[in-house]
């Protein structure tokens, strides 16, 4: 695959995560209940990180947020926090990428510049993907694990039933939600992946350049990597030879410092 | 915590007219359902009437007709008007609330209960 197409399709799986990621954070169903089925209507519960909404056997649904902070368990606190990192580190790895991408040309930004955003972008995804993951994981942990369940409060009174307050035993399922940012987690850290891969590409390869440029008087050798003598030249007139068709080049200019070519 | 305090109660003559009161408070993220039950001395305990937040009603065989459930979901309180009362009326009438206290923390909430005499 060509570098352009892993940067292109990274970005692509990427933005498609993220998409993902908001979506699940937005989402009200990161659980659900069959509350109770009473008398008079059957409830189903459905709770976000937001707000926590009720639909009636009718169809009518109340949804109500969050208002208070205080209230909330920590690993709530917890889970929004790591969403909300996950979104903005998505963010910045968007407008990273954009700027990074190889069909975009921008000014005179040059191939290394490009790679070193790539990457950063790519680093950026890999992170804000995680975070997603461990949130939606932590979450469904908190369900498994029982940890929302209350403990049942009995107050004495009238025909063992008056002033009584009872746990209503319900039965916890993963919502949509958490699907969703598992996925969308998954895809942003595959395109992050996939951003840094295509860094790779980008920069030089230094295996391709490892031409080192002994500046001797009146002489000059440049060695291919392995020890093959690739030129020698006695007098002064051995300038800009060729090693191979890649492009690297010896330069025996009167300069004693290395130039922009000379990989050692 | 959650609290439900009811109201209203008290001795009336058949035929007569009560009007009961159910106030739930605390900490409370939503009430699906609010219910009157009843419950005579030596009898089994059963549902008068009960409404949703979304007005849905169910009423018990024997006071559909005559009473008339109602609420206030803004309050978080639910009435009970009881018309053309009968002796067999008679009895202990508890408020039974069903509550989402918050993330996952559901409560079957009752009160303690009012008493309603039917008698000449």
């Known amino acids: 695959m060509s570098v352009t197409a892993c940067q292109g399709l990274g970005f692509v799986v990427s933005l498609i995560g993220f998409a993902g990621i908001i979506a699940a954070t937005c989402m009200d169903q990161w659980s659900t209940q069959d509350l109770y089925n009473n008398p008079v209507t059957a409830v189903f519960n459905y709770q976000g990180l937001w707000r926590s909404c009720v639909r009636e056997s009718s169809g009518f649904t109340e949804c109500r947020g969050y208002f208070t902070l205080l209230g909330l368990p920590a690993m709530l606190q917890a889970v929004r926090a790591l969403m909300i990192v996950g979104i903005v580190l998505g963010v910045i790895g968007i407008l990273v990428s954009i700027f990074a991408l190889k069909c975009i040309r921008i000014g005179s930004m040059d191939d290394s510049a490009k790679a070193k955003m790539t990457l950063t972008s790519g680093i950026l995804f890999i992170i804000s993907g995680i975070c997603a993951i461990i949130g939606v994981s932590v979450f469904a942990n908190m369900l498994v694990t029982n940890f929302w369940m209350s403990t049942a409060n009995m107050y004495s009174g009238m025909g063992g039933m008056g002033g009584m307050v009872q746990t209503v035993q319900t039965r916890y399922t993963f919502g949509a939600a958490l699907f969703v940012g598992w996925v969308a987690g998954g895809l942003t850290l595959i395109g992050g992946v996939m951003m840094c891969i295509a860094c790779r590409g980008l920069t030089p390869d230094d295996s391709n350049f490892k031409a080192v440029s002994y500046h001797a008087s009146g002489q000059n050798v440049a060695y291919r990597p392995g020890g093959f003598k690739a030129s020698t030249g006695f007098g002064s007139n051995t300038r800009n030879k060729k090693i191979y068709d890649g492009g690297a080049r010896t330069e025996d200019d009167e300069q004693s410092h290395p130039t922009k070519y000379d990989y050692v | 915590e959650v609290q439900v305090v009811e109201s209203g109660g008290g001795l009336v003559q058949p035929g007569g007219s009560l009007r009961l009161s159910c106030a739930a408070s605390?900490?409370?993220?939503?009430?699906?359902?609010m219910s009157w039950y009843r419950q005579a001395p030596g009898k089994q305990r059963e549902l008068v009437a009960g409404i949703s937040t979304g007005g849905t009603t169910n009423y018990g065989d024997s006071v559909k007709g005559r009473f008339t459930i109602s609420r206030d979901n803004a309050k978080n309180t639910v009435y009970l008007q009881m018309n053309s009362l009968k002796p067999e009326d008679t009895a202990a009438y508890y408020c039974n609330v069903l509550v989402v206290s918050g993330i996952g923390s559901h409560l079957e909430v009752w009160g303690q209960g009012t008493l309603v005499t039917v008698s000449s």
């Open positions: 605390g900490s409370i993220l939503h009430i699906p359902v």
